[in-house]
Amino acid sequence: DLLPDDKISLLPPVNFTIKVTGLAQVLLRWEPNPDQEQRNVNLEYQVKINAPKEDDYETRITESKCVTILHKGFSASVRTILQKDHSLLASSWASAELHAPPGSPGTSVVNLTCTTNTTADNYSYLRPYQVSLHCTWLVGTDAPEDTQYFLYYRYGSWTEECQEYSKDSMGRNIACWFPRTFIHSRGRDWLAVLVNGSSKHSAIKPFDQLFALHAIDQINPPLNVTAEIKGTRLSIQWEKPVSAFPIHCFDYEVKIHNARNGYLQIEKMMTNAFISIIDDLSKYDVQVRAAVSSMCREAGLWSEWSQPIYVGKDEHKPLRQW
């Protein structure tokens, strides 16, 4: 139906609520205003996240899922909007908030860092790898001596509590290790990590953090690096790292160090072989490292360098790194 030309009055949504549905995850819900007269027009909603980080977006449905840290609290607003004649009509805002959890800021952990790593899995006959998670943190400066910390991660719909902690000299948990996780190393979901705590003396403030997998995934070094000299040609080959990513998903760097003159050559490539023209009177050490290429996911970390392979003068046969 056509809208009348006279001024349309848009009313704000009602029953706007914020519900925590998981670790670092909230569900925003609201209802159309029952007194809104124009029921048959295409009303939309503008959602504005006020804290902890500003964001806004539009939606036609009356709920929205948000992945966000919650230790600073969470505040959001929603309003009814209508596009009309190239202009935007909008109602006033309806707002709701979650208060920050109790506890002095100095009691929560600091410097929470996490890394994922892909390892061989002896139990799976189809997917021969598994993803482990390792997190470390520092005890809060104002945390009482009897503070104990507990870590949880959420990936997708799975939340798991740490079972393997490392402790400091006072017995406080300062690191966690998950040998097997539900993390998809090729996935795009955020990894949410929460560290909460308890003490007899004061409330320990929880701390949560979101990690992008590409930024924390520690790639394994390339496997089976070999180097061989034939005349003035140094031929280097290797295999892709232990990884869920297929062979075409890797960039490599080869480092060739001339032990005689100290010259360092670093070459970047997408194949798993490299030939360099060299001075056959020298001794060389060769290393290779890998990173997942931007063809397969966002740029991330380089692996450690492989163990050095020594070739050249004083070498009677090529060495192989297993």
């Epitope: 799976s124 997917r127 097997r180 998809h184």
Partner: antibody, heavy 121, light 113 residues
Framework: QVTLKESGGGLVQPGGSLRLSCAAS????????MSWVRQAPGKGLEWVSA????????NYADSVKGRFTISRDNAKNTLYLQMNSLRAEDTAVYYC??????????????WGQGTTVTVSS | QAGLTQPPSVSAAPGQRVTISCSGS?????????VHWYQQVPGTAPKLLIF???NRPSGVPDRFSGSKSGTSASLAITGLQAEDEADYYC????????????FGGGTKLTVLR
């Protein structure tokens, strides 16, 4: 060789309860996440629930959330599904299956033969 | 509506090639999530046929292959045989669903006599 064998199905009235079991053998049960998948008569597959290897973390489809509880006893190599407040639409063959994640989208690599649950008055 | 859409039925003669489509959306296949395929012969439990888009478990003939593009996936069967008559299901991960596991509705493959 992986073997999964379900039991505990039967006829139950709407609102009633039933507990399904799945006995596992041929693999290290305590190292695997496990799940239940069901199939209503003449219909497709529907994932119901899953549980992690240690039994401390669980997941449910919206259709059964709050009514069904998945659990496991690693000492007995057994997976369970406690079904309460049963409805006619829960009538199905219930399969026990491993829930293999290992870095990617979970898949169901091994299945039991299924046990039939009929909810009818 | 979240989910994966498959044709209810397909049919072909022995020796022919047949494909079964699995259409998704941005919240599942379109986000790059892996697709798996299962075969269910009437009266038996499902069996994993293809995992991670295009990988076959040992024992699955190379007549079966999977592919994926955009928001859709396909299962191809070449050199069709009578014993391939079964229901076929695709399965993936959907970020909009509770639990995230999603199956297609299934496709009945009939091998014409």
């Amino acid at each position: 060789q992986v073997t999964l064998k379900e039991s505990g199905g039967g006829l139950v009235q709407p609102g009633g309860s039933l507990r399904l079991s799945c006995a596992a053998s041929g693999f290290t049960f305590s190292n695997y996440a496990m799940s239940w998948v069901r199939q209503a008569p003449g219909k497709g597959l529907e994932w119901v629930s899953a549980i992690n290897s240690g039994g401390k973390s669980t997941n449910y489809a919206d259709s059964v959330k709050g009514r069904f509880t998945i659990s496991r006893d690693n000492a007995k190599n057994t997976l369970y599904l406690q079904m309460n407040s049963l409805r006619a639409e829960d009538t199905a063959v219930y399969y026990c299956a491993d829930y293999a994640t290992n870095y990617g989208v979970p898949y169901f690599g091994s299945w039991g033969q299924g046990t039939t649950v009929t909810v009818s008055s | 509506q979240a989910g994966l859409t498959q044709p209810p039925s397909v049919s072909a003669a022995p020796g022919q090639r047949v494909t079964i489509s699995c259409s998704g959306s941005r919240s599942n296949i379109g986000s790059g999530y892996d697709v798996h395929w299962y075969q269910q012969v009437p009266g038996t439990a499902p069996k994993l046929l293809i995992f991670d888009d295009n990988n076959r478990p040992s024992g699955v003939p190379d007549r079966f292959s999977g592919s994926k593009s955009g928001t859709s996936a396909s299962l191809a069967i070449t050199g069709l045989q009578a014993e391939d008559e079964a229901d076929y299901y695709c399965q993936s991960y959907d970020s909009s669903l509770s639990g995230h596991v999603v199956f297609g509705g299934g496709t009945k493959l009939t091998v014409l006599r």
